[in-house]
Protein backbone atom coordinates (compact mmCIF):
# COMPACT_ATOMS: atom_id res chain seq x y z
CA UNK A 1 0.00 0.00 0.00
CA UNK A 2 1.26 3.72 -1.06
CA UNK A 3 0.80 5.20 1.95
CA UNK A 4 3.00 2.61 4.19
CA UNK A 5 5.68 4.09 1.96
CA UNK A 6 5.36 7.26 3.27
CA UNK A 7 6.16 6.65 6.80
CA UNK A 8 6.34 2.77 7.46
CA UNK A 9 7.28 2.62 10.91
CA UNK A 10 4.37 4.99 11.73
CA UNK A 11 1.80 2.42 10.08
CA UNK A 12 3.43 -0.65 12.08
CA UNK A 13 2.93 0.97 15.10
CA UNK A 14 -0.52 2.06 14.30
CA UNK A 15 -1.61 -1.38 13.11
CA UNK A 16 0.02 -2.84 16.13
CA UNK A 17 -1.70 -1.01 18.24
CA UNK A 18 -5.04 -1.67 16.52
CA UNK A 19 -4.85 -5.06 15.98
CA UNK A 20 -4.42 -5.59 20.02
CA UNK A 21 -1.63 -7.55 19.82
CA UNK A 22 1.31 -6.65 22.54
CA UNK A 23 4.40 -8.56 21.22
CA UNK A 24 4.03 -6.97 17.75
CA UNK A 25 3.63 -3.21 19.53
CA UNK A 26 6.92 -4.45 21.86
CA UNK A 27 8.81 -5.31 18.30
CA UNK A 28 7.84 -2.09 16.54
CA UNK A 29 8.27 0.29 19.35
CA UNK A 30 11.94 -1.41 19.86
CA UNK A 31 12.55 -0.15 16.39
CA UNK A 32 12.51 3.40 17.66
CA UNK A 33 13.80 3.16 20.88
CA UNK A 34 10.85 3.77 22.79
CA UNK A 35 11.59 4.36 26.33
CA UNK A 36 9.31 2.30 29.14
CA UNK A 37 7.10 5.36 29.73
CA UNK A 38 6.55 5.50 26.45
CA UNK A 39 5.75 2.08 25.93
CA UNK A 40 2.62 1.86 28.73
CA UNK A 41 1.24 4.77 27.15
CA UNK A 42 0.79 3.44 23.71
CA UNK A 43 -0.49 -0.16 25.67
CA UNK A 44 -2.95 2.55 27.33
CA UNK A 45 -4.28 3.33 23.82
CA UNK A 46 -4.14 -0.57 22.52
CA UNK A 47 -6.23 -1.29 25.67
CA UNK A 48 -8.82 0.73 24.50
CA UNK A 49 -8.94 -0.67 21.14
CA UNK A 50 -8.93 -4.57 22.89
CA UNK A 51 -11.92 -2.77 24.90
CA UNK A 52 -13.96 -1.84 22.21
CA UNK A 53 -13.10 -5.07 20.09
CA UNK A 54 -12.70 -6.27 16.97
CA UNK A 55 -15.66 -3.86 14.66
CA UNK A 56 -13.75 -0.99 16.72
CA UNK A 57 -10.47 -1.89 15.35
CA UNK A 58 -11.49 -2.05 11.93
CA UNK A 59 -13.68 1.06 12.12
CA UNK A 60 -10.84 2.70 12.98
CA UNK A 61 -8.16 1.09 10.49
CA UNK A 62 -10.59 2.38 7.80
CA UNK A 63 -10.85 6.10 8.89
CA UNK A 64 -6.79 6.10 8.73
CA UNK A 65 -6.50 4.05 5.53
CA UNK A 66 -9.12 6.80 4.43
CA UNK A 67 -7.31 9.75 5.65
CA UNK A 68 -3.58 7.93 4.42
CA UNK A 69 -5.11 7.75 0.91
CA UNK A 70 -7.60 11.06 0.56
CA UNK A 71 -6.16 13.56 -1.31
CA UNK A 72 -4.53 15.53 1.34
CA UNK A 73 -1.57 12.90 1.87
CA UNK A 74 -1.75 11.73 -1.88
CA UNK A 75 -1.34 15.28 -3.17
CA UNK A 76 1.86 15.39 -0.64
CA UNK A 77 3.40 12.49 -1.76
CA UNK A 78 2.72 13.12 -5.37
CA UNK A 79 4.68 16.77 -4.20
CA UNK A 80 7.22 15.25 -2.57
CA UNK A 81 7.91 12.42 -5.49
CA UNK A 82 8.37 15.47 -7.83
CA UNK A 83 10.41 17.60 -5.40
CA UNK A 84 12.41 13.81 -4.87
CA UNK A 85 12.68 13.77 -9.20
CA UNK A 86 14.32 17.07 -9.34
CA UNK A 87 16.72 16.98 -6.68
CA UNK A 88 17.33 13.36 -8.77
CA UNK A 89 17.97 15.27 -11.90
CA UNK A 90 20.04 18.16 -10.58
CA UNK A 91 21.95 15.22 -8.67
CA UNK A 92 23.09 13.70 -12.02
CA UNK B 1 7.77 11.23 5.62
CA UNK B 2 4.36 11.17 7.36
CA UNK B 3 1.49 13.49 5.57
CA UNK B 4 0.23 16.55 7.79
CA UNK B 5 -3.35 14.97 7.60
CA UNK B 6 -2.70 11.82 9.58
CA UNK B 7 -0.49 13.73 11.92
CA UNK B 8 -2.97 15.88 12.97
CA UNK B 9 -5.23 13.14 13.20
CA UNK B 10 -2.98 11.62 15.77
CA UNK B 11 -2.34 14.95 17.53
CA UNK B 12 -5.82 15.03 18.01
CA UNK B 13 -6.16 12.03 19.06
CA UNK B 14 -4.10 12.50 22.38
CA UNK B 15 -4.56 16.29 22.71
CA UNK B 16 -7.86 17.93 21.63
CA UNK B 17 -11.49 17.17 22.83
CA UNK B 18 -13.59 14.50 21.52
CA UNK B 19 -16.01 16.93 19.40
CA UNK B 20 -12.22 18.24 17.67
CA UNK B 21 -11.05 15.34 16.95
CA UNK B 22 -14.39 13.64 15.57
CA UNK B 23 -15.12 16.62 13.62
CA UNK B 24 -11.72 15.93 11.84
CA UNK B 25 -12.55 12.38 11.41
CA UNK B 26 -15.61 13.70 10.15
CA UNK B 27 -14.07 15.31 6.92
CA UNK B 28 -12.87 11.38 5.61
CA UNK B 29 -15.53 9.33 7.12
CA UNK B 30 -18.90 11.08 7.71
CA UNK B 31 -20.19 7.62 8.67
CA UNK B 32 -22.46 7.49 12.05
CA UNK B 33 -21.10 3.94 12.39
CA UNK B 34 -17.42 5.03 12.33
CA UNK B 35 -17.64 8.54 14.22
CA UNK B 36 -19.35 6.97 17.10
CA UNK B 37 -16.56 4.87 17.64
CA UNK B 38 -14.30 7.32 17.48
CA UNK B 39 -15.38 9.29 19.55
CA UNK B 40 -16.13 5.70 21.95
CA UNK B 41 -11.86 5.39 21.50
CA UNK B 42 -10.84 9.08 22.22
CA UNK B 43 -13.62 9.22 25.64
CA UNK B 44 -11.57 6.24 26.73
CA UNK B 45 -7.79 6.79 25.92
CA UNK B 46 -9.10 10.25 27.66
CA UNK B 47 -10.25 8.86 30.67
CA UNK B 48 -7.36 6.26 30.60
CA UNK B 49 -4.31 8.28 29.74
CA UNK B 50 -2.63 10.99 32.18
CA UNK B 51 -0.97 14.02 31.01
CA UNK B 52 1.89 12.13 31.45
CA UNK B 53 1.29 9.41 29.22
CA UNK B 54 0.00 11.31 26.66
CA UNK B 55 3.43 13.44 26.90
CA UNK B 56 5.24 10.01 26.33
CA UNK B 57 2.52 9.19 23.48
CA UNK B 58 3.66 12.44 22.03
CA UNK B 59 7.52 11.76 22.77
CA UNK B 60 7.13 8.44 21.35
CA UNK B 61 5.31 10.00 17.81
CA UNK B 62 8.34 12.81 17.78
CA UNK B 63 10.61 9.91 17.49
CA UNK B 64 8.69 7.87 14.94
CA UNK B 65 8.62 10.56 12.66
CA UNK B 66 12.28 11.57 12.91
CA UNK B 67 12.81 7.61 12.43
CA UNK B 68 15.23 6.65 9.38
CA UNK B 69 12.71 4.62 9.38
CA UNK B 70 9.94 6.91 8.51
CA UNK C 1 -17.60 24.71 25.91
CA UNK C 2 -21.05 23.60 24.65
CA UNK C 3 -23.91 26.04 25.85
CA UNK C 4 -27.11 26.35 24.60
CA UNK C 5 -29.80 28.76 26.04
CA UNK C 6 -33.63 28.34 25.52
CA UNK C 7 -35.78 31.06 25.44
CA UNK C 8 -39.46 31.76 24.38
CA UNK C 9 -41.43 29.57 26.51
CA UNK C 10 -44.41 30.59 28.73
CA UNK C 11 -48.43 30.39 29.50
CA UNK C 12 -50.66 30.21 26.55
CA UNK C 13 -54.01 29.44 25.75
CA UNK C 14 -55.21 26.64 23.76
CA UNK C 15 -55.27 26.80 19.85
CA UNK C 16 -52.41 29.83 20.27
CA UNK C 17 -49.16 29.99 18.90
CA UNK C 18 -45.56 30.55 20.95
CA UNK C 19 -41.94 30.46 19.43
CA UNK C 20 -38.97 29.17 21.16
CA UNK C 21 -35.56 30.20 20.49
CA UNK C 22 -32.30 28.17 21.17
CA UNK C 23 -28.78 29.95 21.03
CA UNK C 24 -26.02 27.93 20.81
CA UNK C 25 -22.50 28.51 21.22
CA UNK C 26 -19.31 27.08 22.18
CA UNK C 27 -19.33 24.48 19.05
CA UNK C 28 -18.97 24.49 15.54
CA UNK C 29 -22.73 25.05 15.10
CA UNK C 30 -23.29 24.29 11.48
CA UNK C 31 -21.91 20.84 11.98
CA UNK C 32 -24.50 19.67 13.86
CA UNK C 33 -27.72 18.31 14.00
CA UNK C 34 -30.33 20.02 16.39
CA UNK C 35 -33.14 18.93 18.15
CA UNK C 36 -35.68 19.80 20.56
CA UNK C 37 -36.85 17.24 22.81
CA UNK C 38 -39.48 17.90 25.79
CA UNK C 39 -40.68 16.62 29.06
CA UNK C 40 -44.39 16.86 30.59
CA UNK C 41 -44.69 17.96 34.63
CA UNK C 42 -43.23 14.38 36.39
CA UNK C 43 -43.35 12.59 33.37
CA UNK C 44 -40.80 10.89 30.73
CA UNK C 45 -38.73 12.69 28.12
CA UNK C 46 -40.06 12.49 24.60
CA UNK C 47 -38.03 13.91 21.26
CA UNK C 48 -40.41 16.16 19.46
CA UNK C 49 -37.81 17.27 16.02
CA UNK C 50 -34.56 17.50 14.36
CA UNK C 51 -33.36 19.47 11.72
CA UNK C 52 -30.18 18.24 10.07
CA UNK C 53 -26.85 20.57 10.36
CA UNK C 54 -27.36 22.20 7.09
CA UNK C 55 -30.98 22.14 7.61
CA UNK C 56 -31.98 20.11 4.69
CA UNK C 57 -33.74 17.56 6.66
CA UNK C 58 -36.78 17.61 8.98
CA UNK C 59 -38.29 15.18 11.49
CA UNK C 60 -41.25 15.34 13.65
CA UNK C 61 -42.72 13.16 16.16
CA UNK C 62 -46.46 11.99 15.03
CA UNK C 63 -48.09 14.44 17.40
CA UNK C 64 -46.82 17.62 16.20
CA UNK C 65 -46.51 17.16 12.29
CA UNK C 66 -48.14 19.58 10.39
CA UNK C 67 -48.46 22.09 14.08
CA UNK C 68 -44.85 22.37 14.78
CA UNK C 69 -42.26 23.85 12.69
CA UNK C 70 -38.17 23.56 13.56
CA UNK C 71 -35.67 25.71 11.55
CA UNK C 72 -32.61 27.20 12.15
CA UNK C 73 -30.42 30.21 10.96
CA UNK C 74 -26.82 29.22 11.17
CA UNK C 75 -25.25 32.31 10.78
CA UNK C 76 -26.76 33.34 14.06
CA UNK C 77 -25.84 29.78 15.42
CA UNK C 78 -29.65 29.85 16.24
CA UNK C 79 -32.57 27.06 16.63
CA UNK C 80 -35.83 27.64 16.22
CA UNK C 81 -39.35 25.35 17.53
CA UNK C 82 -42.58 27.62 16.11
CA UNK C 83 -45.45 26.11 17.70
CA UNK C 84 -48.92 26.43 16.21
CA UNK C 85 -52.50 25.04 17.34
CA UNK C 86 -50.97 24.36 20.86
CA UNK C 87 -53.10 21.89 23.07
CA UNK C 88 -52.87 21.19 26.58
CA UNK C 89 -50.74 17.69 26.32
CA UNK C 90 -48.03 20.30 25.06
CA UNK C 91 -47.63 21.47 28.47
CA UNK C 92 -44.00 20.62 29.19
CA UNK C 93 -40.23 21.59 29.30
CA UNK C 94 -38.80 21.98 26.44
CA UNK C 95 -35.44 21.40 25.88
CA UNK C 96 -32.78 22.28 23.21
CA UNK C 97 -30.70 19.10 22.07
CA UNK C 98 -27.01 18.98 20.25
CA UNK C 99 -26.19 15.63 18.53
CA UNK C 100 -23.12 13.77 19.59
CA UNK C 101 -22.03 13.34 16.17
CA UNK C 102 -21.30 15.62 13.46
CA UNK C 103 -22.85 16.18 9.67
CA UNK C 104 -24.03 12.81 8.53
CA UNK C 105 -24.07 11.94 12.13
CA UNK C 106 -27.47 13.52 13.34
CA UNK C 107 -27.90 10.15 14.48
CA UNK C 108 -30.15 11.33 17.44
CA UNK C 109 -28.06 11.00 20.27
CA UNK C 110 -28.32 14.38 22.42
CA UNK C 111 -24.91 14.83 23.24
CA UNK C 112 -25.72 18.35 25.08
CA UNK C 113 -28.62 19.66 26.58
CA UNK C 114 -29.70 23.35 27.67
CA UNK C 115 -32.02 23.94 30.43
CA UNK C 116 -35.13 24.10 29.04
CA UNK C 117 -37.85 26.41 28.87
CA UNK C 118 -41.53 25.75 30.18
CA UNK C 119 -44.62 26.17 28.08
CA UNK C 120 -47.40 25.71 29.77
CA UNK C 121 -50.75 25.61 26.92
CA UNK C 122 -53.84 26.27 29.32
CA UNK C 123 -57.14 28.56 29.51
CA UNK D 1 -42.61 3.42 16.62
CA UNK D 2 -40.31 1.33 18.88
CA UNK D 3 -41.39 1.17 22.12
CA UNK D 4 -38.55 0.93 24.83
CA UNK D 5 -39.44 -0.45 28.33
CA UNK D 6 -37.70 -0.34 31.59
CA UNK D 7 -37.55 -1.92 34.84
CA UNK D 8 -37.64 -1.41 37.79
CA UNK D 9 -39.54 1.75 36.88
CA UNK D 10 -38.24 2.32 40.46
CA UNK D 11 -35.32 0.89 42.71
CA UNK D 12 -33.96 1.40 46.18
CA UNK D 13 -30.58 1.21 46.86
CA UNK D 14 -27.49 1.88 49.17
CA UNK D 15 -24.15 3.72 48.95
CA UNK D 16 -21.91 1.03 47.47
CA UNK D 17 -24.71 -0.93 45.94
CA UNK D 18 -23.85 -2.55 42.79
CA UNK D 19 -27.41 -1.80 40.52
CA UNK D 20 -28.71 -2.89 37.38
CA UNK D 21 -31.14 -1.38 35.18
CA UNK D 22 -32.83 -3.64 32.45
CA UNK D 23 -33.96 -1.73 28.97
CA UNK D 24 -36.33 -3.38 26.41
CA UNK D 25 -36.84 -2.60 22.85
CA UNK D 26 -40.06 -4.23 20.90
CA UNK D 27 -38.10 -4.82 17.91
CA UNK D 28 -34.30 -5.08 17.09
CA UNK D 29 -32.39 -1.67 17.53
CA UNK D 30 -29.33 -3.13 16.53
CA UNK D 31 -26.54 -1.50 19.10
CA UNK D 32 -28.49 1.99 18.76
CA UNK D 33 -28.66 2.84 22.60
CA UNK D 34 -28.04 5.51 24.66
CA UNK D 35 -28.56 6.09 28.84
CA UNK D 36 -28.88 9.17 30.41
CA UNK D 37 -28.93 10.32 33.91
CA UNK D 38 -31.50 13.13 35.25
CA UNK D 39 -31.57 14.88 38.23
CA UNK D 40 -34.68 16.75 39.12
CA UNK D 41 -35.07 20.26 37.86
CA UNK D 42 -31.53 19.66 35.60
CA UNK D 43 -31.63 18.73 31.88
CA UNK D 44 -30.43 14.76 30.81
CA UNK D 45 -27.23 13.92 30.85
CA UNK D 46 -26.13 11.22 28.39
CA UNK D 47 -24.09 8.63 29.90
CA UNK D 48 -23.24 5.83 27.34
CA UNK D 49 -24.18 5.50 23.98
CA UNK D 50 -24.06 2.93 21.11
CA UNK D 51 -25.16 0.78 23.84
CA UNK D 52 -21.64 0.14 25.53
CA UNK D 53 -19.42 3.62 24.88
CA UNK D 54 -18.55 5.82 27.77
CA UNK D 55 -19.33 9.47 27.52
CA UNK D 56 -16.47 11.77 27.80
CA UNK D 57 -16.13 12.49 32.03
CA UNK D 58 -18.72 9.65 33.23
CA UNK D 59 -17.23 7.54 35.19
CA UNK D 60 -16.19 4.32 34.92
CA UNK D 61 -18.67 2.47 37.25
CA UNK D 62 -21.37 2.69 34.99
CA UNK D 63 -21.10 0.42 31.61
CA UNK D 64 -23.87 -0.69 29.29
CA UNK D 65 -24.35 -3.90 27.55
CA UNK D 66 -26.42 -5.37 25.36
CA UNK D 67 -27.97 -5.59 21.70
CA UNK D 68 -30.94 -6.08 19.41
CA UNK D 69 -33.75 -5.75 22.16
CA UNK D 70 -32.00 -6.44 25.33
CA UNK D 71 -29.84 -4.41 27.13
CA UNK D 72 -28.67 -3.14 30.85
CA UNK D 73 -26.74 -0.09 32.41
CA UNK D 74 -24.71 -1.06 35.14
CA UNK D 75 -23.44 0.76 37.69
CA UNK D 76 -21.30 -1.09 39.74
CA UNK D 77 -20.88 0.83 43.25
CA UNK D 78 -23.34 3.18 44.26
CA UNK D 79 -21.85 6.74 44.75
CA UNK D 80 -24.74 9.69 46.45
CA UNK D 81 -24.57 11.59 43.09
CA UNK D 82 -26.23 8.35 41.41
CA UNK D 83 -28.82 8.83 42.77
CA UNK D 84 -31.08 10.11 40.02
CA UNK D 85 -34.05 8.97 36.99
CA UNK D 86 -32.16 7.22 34.46
CA UNK D 87 -33.71 6.84 30.61
CA UNK D 88 -32.52 4.76 27.60
CA UNK D 89 -33.41 5.94 24.34
CA UNK D 90 -33.54 4.37 20.70
CA UNK D 91 -31.82 6.13 17.94
CA UNK D 92 -32.65 2.88 15.53
CA UNK D 93 -34.91 5.05 13.33
CA UNK D 94 -35.75 8.69 12.99
CA UNK D 95 -38.08 8.61 15.39
CA UNK D 96 -35.94 8.22 18.50
CA UNK D 97 -37.92 6.90 21.70
CA UNK D 98 -37.02 6.81 25.14
CA UNK D 99 -37.80 4.42 28.06
CA UNK D 100 -40.46 5.20 30.64
CA UNK D 101 -37.30 5.91 33.02
CA UNK D 102 -36.14 4.23 36.27
CA UNK D 103 -35.54 6.62 39.52
CA UNK D 104 -33.01 5.10 41.97
CA UNK D 105 -33.74 6.26 45.27
CA UNK D 106 -32.16 5.67 48.74
CA UNK D 107 -33.02 2.57 50.41
Known amino acids: VKMAETCPIFYDVFFAVANGNELLLDLSLTKVNATEPERTAMKKIQDCYVENGLISRVLDGLVMTTISSSKDCMGEAVQNTVEDLKLNTLGR | EICPAVKRDVDLFLTGTPDEYVEQVAQYKALPVVLENARILKNCVDAKMTEEDKENALSLLDKIYTSPLC | QVVLVESGGGVVQPGRSLRLSCAAS????????MHWVRQAPGKGLEWVAVIWYDGSNKYYVDSVKGRFTISRDNSNNTIYLQMNSLRAEDTAVYYC????????????????WGQGTLVTVSS | DIQMTQSPSTLSASVGDRVTITCRAS??????LAWYQQKPGKAPKLLIF???GLESGVPFRFSGSGSGTEFTLTISSLQPDDFATYYC?????????FGQGTKVEIK
Open chain 4, 89 to 97: QQYNTYSPT
Open chain 4, 50 to 52: KAS
Open chain 4, 27 to 32: QSVSSW
Open chain 3, 97 to 112: ARSLIPVAGTDPIFGY
Open chain 3, 26 to 33: GFTFSSYG
